[in-house]
C-alpha cells in the first residue's frame, strides 16, 4: 500500500505558437482545480478502465479575474497536494492522466459551471520511494509543470511497496538475514511472507504464502525461464523440465475483480475492466456519483444521483470512453477524401491533397482543363491530374504557344510539295495525285476518287489544309 | 460587400505598446480565422497570428509568441496587441481572413490554409 | 518552419508575352500552395490556391501548377495591369504542433 503524490507547480501559457486568452474575466471570474487519473502499466489506456490505480480531485484555486487588455499570466492554484492511495503493490510503470478544470463563479443557474482547460496524459516509470520526479507538458497553448512521487505507507516499503518492515527486537542491530528498512533506520525488514523459495529476482508477492512471477518467468517459485518455442497450453505454471507452459492457475481463476468486473492477464498480474460506478484495482471502489465529476473533457455526467444508481457519461465531440477519457483521434475516421494527408491541427481539421485533387477536403476531382486555355486553336486533354494540349498544327508546346514547322513531318503525300501557311500548311501535289494530304489518286479517265472537287480547284492545284 | 477594416496604426516611440483594431462586415465571422499579416517596406508579407472564430483558438508564429496577442473583441472584430515595439516592427499590419470549411456530420472544421480576403492594411511607424 | 524559396526576383516581358515564376517549399506541401499578386499600396490579392485553382474572377492567362515541392506560376498574354509583385505562400503543421503560414520573397513582374 501506498500514495501516489502529484504536486502541481504551474499553469500558464506555454512558448507554443499561440497565446491563450485568460480563462477568467471580469463578467466572469473563476478558479481552477486539477484532477488526476493513474493507471497501472505503460499500454495503450483501455477506454472501458477508467483510473484504475485510483483518482483524485484537488481543492478548489483561489478566485481569478482577467486583467482587461493582460495576456494570460501563470493562474493561482490551489493549495496542497493531489494524493492517490494504492492499496496493492505499486506496479513501477503508470500512465496519468491530469486535468485542469476552470470553475466559473459567476451568475449560472444552478451553481457554477465547470469546463476543462487542458489535458495531459502520459505514461512513465517510476519506483515507490524514490525522489520527486519533475515533469513538463503541454496541452494546446498551455503548459503545465508538475512534480511526483510514490511512497510507500508504512509498514511497507521497496520500489513496490511490497516488503514489509516491522519495528527492531532489538536497539542495535537487525536478525539474522535481515537488512534495516531505508528510509526508516530504526526499522528491520520483516521476514519474507511470499511462498518459501520464490525467486527473490523473477518473483513478488503481495499476500503471504504467494509467488507471482515477473514477465518471462513460470513455474510454482518462478525460477523457470518460458521458453518461446511452441507449447500446447496457453499459461503456466511450467513444466521444469521443458520450460514450456503446463496448465495451472492464471491470475484470473476465480476472477479477483469485484462488483462484476471482468478480469484480463497481464504479463506481471492480471487487470479489472470495471462496470459503470465501481473502480480500482479489483473494482471494490465504488460510490462514485456525478457529484464527483467522474466525466472528463467537459462530458456531461447524467444520473448517478446517489452511489446505488450509476452514471452514464455523454462525450463532447473528438471524446469517447465510459469517463469520456480517450481523445478520438479525429484523423482515424479518414475525413480527408482522395487519398489526402490529414493534419489534426487541434482546432481543426486540415486535408492535404493529393495531386488532381483540390477543396477543403480533397472532394474535388480537378477538371484539368478548367481555367487553362490552349492558345493558338489548341484543344484540352485531361489526364492525372495534369492537363496536355493538343496543338492545332503550325504550333506545339504545352500551352500551343510556340510555333512548329507543319512541314516537319513530311505530311504530304505522294511526292507533294509541302508549304508553311499562316494558318497550317499547304500541299503541292505531284502530277496525279490530288487532296489535302495529296492522299487521292487521279484515275486516268479523269475521274478522281474524290466524290467531287470543290468548286474552283482542279486536279493538281494546290490543297489548303484546314 | 465582404470588407476588412484596420484601424489604430501610427508613429510610436520605441518600447511601447499598441492595439490595432480589425473590424470585418459583409460576412459572417463564424467559420473563418482572422489574421494578422505585416509587411515592412520593400519587404514580402510576414505572418503574425490568427484567431479561430469558433472557438477562440489562437496561434502564431514563433518568433511572435510573448509581443503578439490576438483577441477577439467582438463578433465582427479582433485586435492585436504589440508591446515592446522597435524600429524592426515597423510595417504595414494587414488584417487577412483564412476561411474554414465546415461540413454537416463531419468530425471538425476544415482549415483552407490561405487568405482570401485582405483589408487596406494600417502603417505602424516606430521611431524616436 | 517551412521556407518558400522564390525565383526569380524580378523578371522582364513584353506585353502578350509569358512570364513564369518558380516557388520552392523546403518540405512536401502536397498541393497546400496559393498565389497573391500585389500591387504598390494594395494588400495583396488572392489569385490561386491549391497549387492551380484559379479564384473566381481571375483570368486565365493565368495558370498554375506544381505538386510536392516545386511549383510554378505562368502568366501568357502580358498585358501592362499584370505589372505587380506576386508571392507564393503556404500553411505548416509542424510536428511539435505549431500551425502557421509562410511567404516567398516575392518576384517582381515589369511589363515593357
Known amino acids: 500500500a501506498g500514495v501516489f503524490e502529484l504536486q502541481i507547480h504551474s499553469f500558464g501559457p506555454g512558448p507554443g505558437p499561440g497565446a491563450p486568452r485568460s480563462p477568467c474575466s471580469a463578467r466572469l471570474p473563476c478558479r481552477l482545480f486539477f484532477r488526476v487519473c493513474l493507471k497501472p502499466g505503460l499500454s495503450e489506456e483501455a477506454a472501458e478502465s477508467p483510473c484504475a490505480l485510483g483518482a483524485a480531485l484537488s481543492a478548489r484555486g483561489p478566485v481569478y479575474t482577467e486583467q482587461p487588455g493582460a495576456p494570460a499570466p501563470d493562474l493561482p492554484l490551489p493549495d496542497g497536494l493531489l494524493q492517490v492511495p494504492f492499496r496493492d503493490a505499486w506496479p513501477g510503470t503508470f500512465s496519468f492522466i491530469i486535468e485542469t478544470w476552470r470553475e466559473e463563479l459567476g451568475d449560472q443557474i444552478g451553481g457554477p459551471a465547470w469546463s476543462l482547460l487542458a489535458r495531459v496524459a502520459g505514461r512513465r516509470r517510476l519506483a515507490a520511494g524514490g525522489p520527486w520526479a519533475r515533469d513538463i507538458q503541454r496541452a494546446g497553448a498551455w503548459e503545465l509543470r508538475f512534480s511526483y512521487r510514490a511512497r510507500c505507507e508504512p509498514p511497507a516499503v521497496g520500489t513496490a511497496c511490497t516488503r514489509l518492515c516491522r519495528p527492531r527486537s532489538a536497539p542495535s542491530r537487525c536478525g539474522p538475514g535481515l537488512r534495516p528498512c531505508a528510509p526508516l533506520e530504526d526499522e528491520c525488514e520483516a521476514p519474507l511472507v511470499c511462498r518459501a523459495g520464490c525467486s527473490p529476482e523473477h518473483g513478488f508477492c503481495e499476500q503471504p504464502g504467494e509467488c507471482r512471477c515477473l514477465e518471462g518467468w513460470t513455474g510454482p517459485l518462478c525460477t523457470v525461464p518460458v521458453s518461446t518455442s511452441s507449447c500446447l497450453s496457453p499459461r503456466g505454471p511450467s513444466s521444469a523440465t521443458t520450460g514450456c507452459l503446463v496448465p495451472g492457475p492464471g491470475p484470473c481463476d476465480g476472477n479477483p475483480c469485484a462488483n462484476g468486473g471482468s478480469c484480463s492477464e497481464t504479463p506481471r498480474s492480471f487487470e479489472c475492466t470495471c462496470p459503470r460506478g465501481f473502480y480500482g484495482l479489483r473494482c471494490e471502489v465504488s460510490g462514485v456519483t456525478c457529484a464527483d465529476g467522474p466525466c472528463f473533457n467537459g462530458g456531461l455526467c447524467v444520473g448517478g444521483a446517489d452511489p446505488d444508481s450509476a452514471y452514464i457519461c455523454h462525450c463532447p465531440p473528438g471524446f469517447q470512453g465510459s469517463n469520456c477519457e480517450k481523445r478520438v483521434d479525429r484523423c482515424s475516421l479518414q475525413p480527408c477524401r482522395n487519398g489526402g494527408l490529414c493534419l489534426d491541427l487541434g482546432h481543426a481539421l486540415r486535408c492535404r491533397c493529393r495531386a488532381g485533387f483540390a477543396g477543403p477536403r480533397c472532394e474535388h476531382d480537378l477538371d484539368d482543363c478548367a481555367g487553362r486555355a490552349c492558345a493558338n486553336g489548341g484543344t484540352c486533354v485531361e489526364g492525372g491530374g495534369a492537363h496536355r494540349c493538343s496543338c492545332a498544327l503550325g504550333f506545339g508546346g504545352r500551352d500551343c504557344r510556340e510555333r512548329a514547322d507543319p512541314c516537319a513531318a513530311r505530311p504530304c503525300a505522294h511526292g507533294g510539295r509541302c508549304y508553311a501557311h499562316f494558318s497550317g500548311l499547304v500541299c503541292a501535289c505531284a502530277p496525279g495525285y490530288m487532296g489535302a494530304r495529296c492522299e487521292f489518286p487521279v484515275h486516268p479517265d479523269g475521274a478522281s476518287a474524290l466524290p467531287a472537287a470543290p468548286p474552283g480547284l482542279r486536279p493538281g492545284d494546290p490543297q489548303r489544309y484546314l | 460587400q465582404e470588407q476588412l477594416v484596420e484601424s489604430g496604426g501610427g508613429l510610436v516611440q520605441p518600447g511601447a505598446s499598441l492595439t490595432l483594431t480589425c473590424k470585418a462586415s459583409?460576412?459572417?465571422?463564424?467559420?473563418?480565422?482572422m489574421c494578422w499579416v505585416r509587411q515592412a517596406p520593400g519587404k514580402g508579407p510576414e505572418w503574425i497570428a490568427c484567431?479561430?472564430?469558433?472557438?477562440?483558438?489562437a496561434y502564431s508564429a514563433s518568433w511572435a509568441k510573448g509581443r503578439f496577442t490576438v483577441s477577439k473583441t467582438s463578433s465582427t472584430a479582433v485586435t492585436l496587441q504589440v508591446t515592446g515595439l522597435t524600429a524592426a516592427d515597423t510595417a504595414t499590419y494587414f488584417c487577412?481572413?483564412?476561411?474554414?470549411?465546415?461540413?454537416?456530420?463531419?468530425?471538425?472544421?476544415?482549415?483552407?490554409?490561405?487568405?482570401?480576403?485582405w483589408g487596406p492594411g494600417t502603417l505602424v511607424t516606430v521611431s524616436s | 518552419d517551412i521556407v518558400m524559396t522564390q525565383t526569380p526576383a524580378s523578371v522582364e516581358a513584353a506585353v502578350g508575352g509569358t512570364v513564369t515564376i518558380k516557388c520552392q517549399a523546403s518540405e512536401n506541401i502536397y498541393n497546400s500552395l496559393a498565389w497573391y499578386q500585389q500591387k504598390p499600396g494594395q494588400p495583396p490579392k488572392l489569385l490561386m490556391h491549391d497549387a492551380s485553382v484559379l479564384t473566381s474572377g481571375v483570368p486565365s492567362r493565368f495558370s498554375g501548377s506544381g505538386y510536392g515541392t516545386e511549383f510554378t506560376l505562368t502568366i501568357s498574354d502580358l498585358e501592362c495591369a499584370d505589372a505587380a509583385t506576386y508571392y507564393c505562400?503556404?500553411?505548416?503543421?509542424?510536428?511539435?504542433?505549431?500551425?502557421?503560414?509562410?511567404f516567398g520573397g516575392g518576384t517582381e513582374v515589369v511589363v515593357k
Open positions: 505562400q503556404s500553411d505548416y503543421y509542424s510536428t511539435g504542433g505549431s500551425y502557421g503560414f509562410a
Open positions: 484567431i479561430y472564430n469558433d472557438d477562440g483558438s
Open positions: 487577412a481572413r483564412s476561411p474554414y470549411y465546415t461540413y454537416g456530420g463531419a468530425p471538425s472544421a476544415y482549415a483552407s490554409g490561405y487568405f482570401n480576403l
Open positions: 459583409g460576412f459572417d465571422f463564424t467559420s473563418n480565422a
